[in-house]
């Protein structure tokens, strides 16, 4: 099983910080994470270093390291938060397509874990969610609308309370397709 350094499940840094993530395995290892700027990758046999000297809110996300040659398929992960006071959300996709009754993950990642208590999901232009919308939130993954319905095909925004005011993410379009 590969091991990531730093050896913490979460890392919180400020914008502009230098971040170094190292993964060590028995064989060659590979990184997987959110598509974001500024990363450089250096691999040396059984070790791989991912680094940036200018972290931005877009680097927020979960970085997973796998060992392709491992028959057990083990992996290790670390979640990086780049807490930008002006950017509470890092949206990984602006369109999500699911079939009816599947869970729909709206991937807006919180850039500062402290804000978790004040998050909510709204429809664009501040409209409330449709009645009976059952959703949950994970700061690592975003909002999940459970057992999505066709009628919930809407444009959504993630909202975070910062200094008493609501700050919205860019919109995410949810398309819920009927199962034929």
């Amino acid at each position: 099983i590969p091991v990531i350094e730093p050896s913490v499940p979460e890392l919180v840094v400020k914008p502009g910080a230098t971040v170094t993530l190292r993964c060590v395995g028995n064989g060659s290892v590979e990184w997987d994470g959110p598509p974001s700027p500024h990363w450089t990758l250096y691999s040396d046999g059984s070790s791989s270093i991912l680094s940036t000297n200018n972290a931005t809110f877009q680097n927020t996300g979960t970085y997973r390291c796998t060992e392709p040659g491992d028959p057990l398929g083990g992996s290790a992960a670390i979640h990086l938060y780049v807490k930008d006071p002006a950017r509470p959300w890092n949206v990984l996709a602006q369109e999500v397509v699911v079939f009816e009754d599947q869970d729909a993950l709206l991937p807006c990642l919180l850039t500062d874990p402290v804000l978790e208590a004040g998050v909510s999901l709204v429809r664009v232009r501040g409209r409330p969610l449709m009645r009976h919308t059952n959703y949950s939130f994970s700061p690592w993954h975003g909002f999940t609308i459970h057992r999505a319905k066709f009628i919930q095909s809407q444009d959504y925004q993630c909202s975070a309370l910062m200094g008493g005011r609501k700050v919205m993410s860019i919109s995410i379009r949810l398309k819920v397709q009927k199962v034929i």
């Epitope: 730093p6 050896s7 913490v8 890392l11 919180v12 910080a17 170094t20």
Partner: antibody
């Protein structure tokens, strides 16, 4: 509110065994990495062992001084972490703290005291 | 293993003064350093993580700095509740070693 409560400390003879327990509440225990840290006047704060979450294959790590003698384990259904200590030595004496790892050792229990003496 | 050398071991200061505690790692730990405060008879409490980030609820008179192998914790305008022991610790792999501690006493 995050709460960690250790139990199981006491007096034990050199070569003996002891099992410490830590009951956790106030957070999603199954997602957490849990560690044991001990403290003595001679050694200061000393990291002992770690067990990671199921997502991290419940991987375990140990300080060299306890490897082969101590075993860390967890029961996610009981939100508890344990430290089984065998072949105890006088230098294992100290206060044992259960901690949760997030961005550091974010939360600590109140500690339980182990004394290894004849 | 990475060794953490903390200095000074003890410090006698007055309320209102500014103090700096330093911690040196035996190799580059890439800013993966935490600082803890421990009051007599109590458990340690996280003060700073990732070298410069204050933990939730920590007053702004505390600040962490440093990179590579050299790190420091600064306390501006010491308050009576700041007296106690301070420890650094690295998170660059295992074992996660602590510094030897700095005891802050009232002059």
């Amino acid at each position: 509110e995050v709460k960690l409560e250790e139990s199981g400390g006491g007096l034990v003879q050199p070569g003996g065994s002891m099992k410490l327990s830590c009951a956790a509440s106030g957070f999603t225990f199954s997602d957490a990495w849990m560690d044991w840290v001990r403290q003595s006047p001679e050694m200061g704060l000393e990291w002992v062992a770690e067990i990671r979450s199921k997502a991290n294959n419940h991987a375990t790590f140990y300080a060299e001084s306890v490897k082969g003698r101590f075993t860390i384990s967890r029961d996610d259904s009981k939100s508890s972490v344990y430290l089984q200590m065998n072949s105890l030595r006088p230098e294992d004496t100290g206060i044992y703290y259960c901690t949760r790892v997030k961005v550091g050792f974010d939360n600590w229990g109140q500690g339980t005291t182990l004394t290894v003496s004849s | 293993d990475i060794q953490m050398t903390q200095s000074p071991a003890s410090l006698s200061v007055s309320v209102g003064e500014t103090v700096t505690i330093t911690c040196r790692a035996s190799e580059n730990i890439y800013s993966n350093l935490a600082w803890y405060q421990q009051k007599q008879g109590k458990s340690p409490q996280l003060l700073v993580h990732a070298a410069t980030n204050l933990a939730d609820g920590v007053p702004s008179r505390f600040s962490g700095s440093g990179s590579g192998t050299q790190y420091s914790l600064k306390i501006n305008s010491l308050q009576s509740e700041d007296f106690g022991s301070y420890y650094c610790q690295h998170f660059w792999g295992t074992p996660r070693t602590f510094g030897g501690g700095t005891k802050l006493e009232i002059k």
